[in-house]
């Protein structure tokens, strides 16, 4: 807190300009009006101050505003968004994705702090909706920003914005993510052919139902078994070794490697024998031949 | 991101030396840079500026004339050349720096001892 001192004659700021790196923290806190200050805020991300002058700026234009900064002033805050708290960024009404991406670059390369989760917060919620444009906006700056919302606030993303989303957004989604975000690809893609189609659902597979993988095996796809490894274990274990081969085509050999781990593993145990023998991998742990094989959850659904 | 100055050290009264502030991580090509400096005891004082295309430079009154701050974008560095030192001019000097959008890097600081 810089001590209230009158400002010595001469030095009253007629403008934000380089020469106020010359005054001490009480010159400033004496000599630089908040208006002023607030209407050139620009200029201050072109002048080298240090820290502590930054902090009493910050100071000057709390103290014009209580209840929250104006978004013209809030746009042109450079540096000093990353001395905001959240509490103060809380109080903030910010509607321009254009502010967005001033205050996002000033935390460029950094992790995702408190500050700018709040700023994103404030944002989409009054937006209504997580659009198209601002996800672009978020996902080029946080690759990993989709599978930061919970499935309830990714519920709110239109099927539309889905088209921002690269392979890379969804690297570190749990499989409850990818529920909610899977269906909304296979409705913004659904008019895409065949081969074009399989390249955008991708990476949202982790997401997919036994019927849609079913549909798929008749495709001629030859999923990775990268992508194979991320498909739910409940949507895996009723295909068929036939429907498995037509889903993996010539990458069906990768299975081999992966037969000690989920969901190939557990889809092992539950085909025959037989059946496993027939794709020539040396697959073993399927159900022995004469065997037979009791659905009990149809048998309680029936009862 | 950081800034690094360098070339400090002790010096009698009237002599001469340079300070060089170099980036690391990053290059310094589109940041304006200040010069400051901190006597023991005292608050922090500006005492140069240079702007980024080095077109436009600022002196503190107590320096005019004998501190020329200048750079060489070729080599990434802000030079601060301070002659005719005066016991006064004691104190640790830093080097801060400003980007686009406002980002912001300072230096850990080099010290100047005239006695």
């Known amino acids: 807190e810089v001590e209230k001192t009158a400002c010595p004659s001469g030095k009253k700021a007629r403008e934000i300009d380089e020469s106020l790196i010359f005054y001490k923290k009480w010159e400033l806190e004496a000599c630089v009006d908040a208006a002023l200050l607030a209407t050139q805020m620009d200029r201050v991300n072109a002048i080298p101050f240090t820290y502590e002058q930054l902090d009493v700026l910050k100071h000057k234009l709390d103290e014009l505003y209580p209840q929250g900064y104006p978004e013209s002033v809030i746009q042109h805050l450079g540096y000093l968004f990353l001395k905001m708290s959240p509490e103060d960024i809380r109080k903030w009404n910010v509607t321009s994705l254009e502010t967005l991406k001033a205050l996002l670059e000033v935390n460029k390369g950094h992790e995702m702090s408190p500050q700018v989760a709040t700023l994103i917060d404030r944002f989409v919620k009054g937006r209504g909706q997580l659009d198209k444009d601002t996800l672009d906006t978020l996902t080029a700056f946080y690759p990993g920003y989709l599978c930061s919302l919970s499935p309830e606030e990714l519920s709110s993303v239109p099927p539309s914005s889905i088209w921002a989303v690269r392979p890379q957004d969804l690297d570190t989604c749990d499989p409850r993510q990818l529920d909610v975000l899977y269906p909304k690809a296979r409705l913004a893609f659904q008019n895409m052919n065949g081969s074009e189609y399989f390249v955008k659902i991708q990476s949202f597979l982790g997401g997919a139902p036994t019927e849609d993988l079913k549909a798929l095996s008749q495709q001629n796809v030859s999923m990775d078994l990268a992508t194979f490894m991320k498909l739910r274990t409940d949507a895996v274990l009723p295909l068929t070794v036939a429907e498995v081969q037509k889903l993996l085509g010539p990458h069906v050999e990768g299975l081999k490697a992966e037969e000690r781990h989920r969901p190939v593993r557990d889809w092992i145990l539950r085909q025959r024998q037989d059946d496993l023998d027939t794709l020539g991998l040396g697959l073993q742990g399927g159900i022995p031949n004469g065997y037979l094989v009791l659905d009990l959850s149809m048998q309680e659904a029936l009862s | 991101l950081q800034l690094v100055e360098s070339g400090g050290g002790l010096v009698q009264p009237g002599g001469s030396l340079r300070l060089s502030c170099a980036a690391s991580?990053?290059?310094?090509?589109?940041?304006?840079i200040g010069w400051f400096r901190q006597a023991p005891g005292k608050e922090r004082e500006g005492v140069s500026s240079?702007?980024?295309?080095?077109?436009?430079?600022n002196y503190a009154d107590s320096v005019k004339g004998r501190f020329t701050v200048s750079r060489d974008n070729a080599k990434h560095t802000v030079y601060l050349q301070m002659n005719s030192l005066k016991p006064e001019d004691t104190a640790v000097y830093y080097c801060?720096?400003?980007?686009?959008?406002?980002?912001?890097?300072m230096g850990q600081g080099t010290s100047v001892t005239v006695s």
């Open positions: 801060a720096g400003v980007g686009d959008y406002g980002r912001r890097v």
């Open positions: 991580g990053f290059t310094l090509d589109n940041y304006a």
């Open positions: 240079i702007s980024s295309s080095g077109g436009s430079t």
